[in-house]
């Protein structure tokens, strides 16, 4: 199809060679007067659409993406030729950075329902450049964490070295939807909830005497819990004595709850105390039996092939530890009567 009638948008992706980052292109279709498919014009940030970057009753996935080869060859279907580029509804996700992503990307409706739709397309000229050393050394990361329940902020990586006063107007999107009230280079979150996580995109316009282009950065925001302030607690065994039958096999389970730590090095082990001696027992590997956002429960068993009289004089101690401290729980075996 003839792409000369497509509206054109120029974008710049400056990527950091130090970190993994992603990039997105929105199928930002214009609105020819009589087209029913391209259901929106460029929106001012005051107009909040239901969906961004695409509106209308049509299925949001009803767009086709192409790349225009620089050598003038026919347009290539993105899905067939570029495994590192994923189409999700109206958005094109670039999973890996690199100058080889530079080029012209065209999107248009899959279904051409009227002659007007032929010109309903947008051509995005993407320039991809590695960040130069002269760029800001402490630019914000493309992966940012927000602490649940606290105050936090999301910074636009390409503008994080500029003060709020000198920063240009920024357009923010979250999961493809326009955040109409956000215009600065930083989004401040008064209280962080789990719904604040997602893919944020910040755009601002740069221009020289010849042309203008959109500088875009993508930020993956995670919501996390803060590191625990507590040492682990032992959930099992609860009792300090255990009735057993002599000569029978026995498994004692130690289950301990460890609070969340970003650097997580849990210790869970069994040792035996016999009068003045104590030694660690080589027991099966510890295994995680539950994982939540706030904590992890780890289990480690001690297995006795058969309980002997000597075992009744010993104490079996489960020892657990994290970066805050340690906890122990000892179990004394007692012969079952009758």
């Amino acid at each position: 199809f003839n792409i000369s009638g497509c509206s054109t948008k120029k974008l710049l992706w400056t990527y950091s060679t130090r970190s993994e980052e992603e990039f997105v292109l929105f199928c930002d279709l214009p609105e020819p007067q009589k087209s029913h498919f391209c259901h929106r014009n460029r929106l001012s940030p005051k107009q909040v659409p239901e969906h961004l970057p695409f509106m209308g009753s049509n299925d949001l996935s009803d767009v086709q993406w192409y790349q225009q080869p620089s050598n003038g060859d026919p347009l290539e279907d993105i899905r067939k030729s570029y495994p590192h580029i994923i189409q999700d509804k109206c958005t094109l996700h670039f999973l890996t950075p690199g100058v080889n992503n530079s080029g012209s990307y065209i999107c248009r409706p899959k279904m051409i329902k009227s002659p007007y739709d032929v010109a309903c397309c947008v051509k995005m000229i993407l320039e991809v450049k590695p960040q130069t050393n002269a760029s800001c050394e402490y630019s914000a990361s493309h992966k940012q964490d927000l602490l649940l329940g606290s105050t936090g902020s999301i910074s636009c990586p390409s503008l994080s070295c500029q003060s709020d006063a000198q920063s240009p107007a920024v357009t923010w999107y979250k999961n493809g939807k326009l955040l109409s009230v956000e215009r600065s280079n930083r989004i401040v979150v008064d209280e962080v909830y789990d719904y604040h996580q997602g893919t944020y995109v910040c755009d601002y316009t740069q221009s020289d005497t010849v042309s203008s282009w959109t500088v875009r950065a993508v930020v993956q925001v995670r919501t996390i819990v803060g590191d625990t302030k507590l040492k682990p607690d032992i959930l099992d065994p609860v009792e300090d004595t255990l009735e057993v039958e002599l000569g029978k096999p026995l498994t004692i389970s130690c289950k301990a709850r460890f609070g969340f730590e970003r650097v997580f090095n849990p210790v869970i082990k069994w040792y035996i105390k016999d009068s003045d001696l104590e030694w660690e027992v080589s027991v099966p590997e510890a295994k995680s039996i539950k994982s939540t956002l706030k904590d992890e429960i780890i289990e480690r068993n001690i297995i006795l092939e058969k309980v002997t009289q000597r075992d009744l004089r010993r104490k079996f101690v489960c020892f657990v530890q994290n970066s805050i401290g340690n906890t122990t729980q000892s179990v004394q075996l007692k012969e079952k009567r009758g």
Epitope: N175, G176, D194, Y195, Q197, G198, T199, Q220, V221, R222, T223, I224, L235, D236, K255, I289, K290, S291, T292, L293, K294, I297, E299
Partner: antibody
Framework: SVEESGGRLVTPGTPLTLTCTVS????????LGWVRQAPGKGLEYIGY?????SAYYATWVNGRFTISKTSTTVDLKMTSLTAADTATYFC?????????????WGPGTLVTVSS | AAVLTQTPSPVSAAVGGTVSISCQSS????????LAWFQQKPGQPPKLLIY???TLASGVPSRFKGSGSGTQFTLTISDVQCDDAATYYC???????????FGGGTEVVVK
């Protein structure tokens, strides 16, 4: 959003992988679980994959199913399928605490096991 | 594995009335409160109503109330509406996730 795919008619014993594709959800801060429902029956919990990538399964699974993930998908690999595994398979996102409050569900994908 | 036993189906309720569904667990749920309630209508995926035994999920009307602790839990629907006709499930979570599971479901019929 979350959406399941890969459900189809298979013969007993044929392995099958279902995929749950997420968008706008960071799997490094959300657990994602699988639940199934046989026609006309109740919900059955299969298991979940934690934010750190560890998988946890209901006792009845007994090693037949495996849950794994990439940054945007969670797979449920099923082996030794029998007619009893015929069901709609749902994936569900949990962001509250790890594995107990599935607050966002996909529409489900139907798996039929029949000779 | 833990067993979750729900009120047998069906349970009838009159519009504007109150209905209660119980869920009993054979083991104590994690933290005494790791129990969730779901509503499911034919042809739809389940919808979360209550988590943490008593916390109302986002967007759920306050007519739905969860209570209980340990092994015994109840979902109460007050001022029942026609739209509440559905099957309700409890989901328990335990110290070991391998014990996690749903109750058998309770169908609520609204008259």
């Amino acid at each position: 959003s979350v959406e399941e795919s890969g459900g189809r008619l298979v013969t007993p014993g044929t392995p099958l992988t279902l995929t749950c594709t997420v968008s706008g959800i960071d799997l490094s801060s959300n657990a994602l679980g699988w639940v199934r429902q046989a026609p006309g029956k109740g919900l059955e919990y299969i298991g979940y994959i934690s934010t750190g990538g560890s998988a946890y399964y209901a006792t009845w699974v007994n090693g037949r199913f495996t849950i794994s993930k990439t940054s945007t998908t969670v797979d449920l690999k099923m082996t030794s399928l029998t007619a009893a595994d015929t069901a709609t398979y749902f994936c569900a996102r949990d962001s509250y605490a790890g594995d107990y409050a599935f607050n966002l569900w996909g529409p489900g994908t139907l798996v039929t096991v029949s000779s | 594995a833990a067993v979750l036993t729900q009120t047998p189906s069906p349970v009838s309720a009159a519009v504007g009335g109150t209905v209660s569904i119980s869920c009993q667990s054979s083991k104590t749920v994690y933290n005494n409160n790791w129990l969730a309630w779901f509503q499911q209508k034919p042809g739809q995926p389940p919808k979360l109503l209550i988590y943490g035994a008593s916390t109302l999920a986002s967007g759920v009307p306050s007519r739905f109330k969860g209570s209980g602790s340990g092994t015994q839990f109840t979902l109460t629907i007050s001022d029942v509406q026609c739209d509440d006709a559905a099957t309700y499930y409890c989901l328990g979570s335990y110290i070991s996730s391998s014990d996690n599971g749903f109750g058998g479901g309770t169908e609520v019929v609204v008259k």
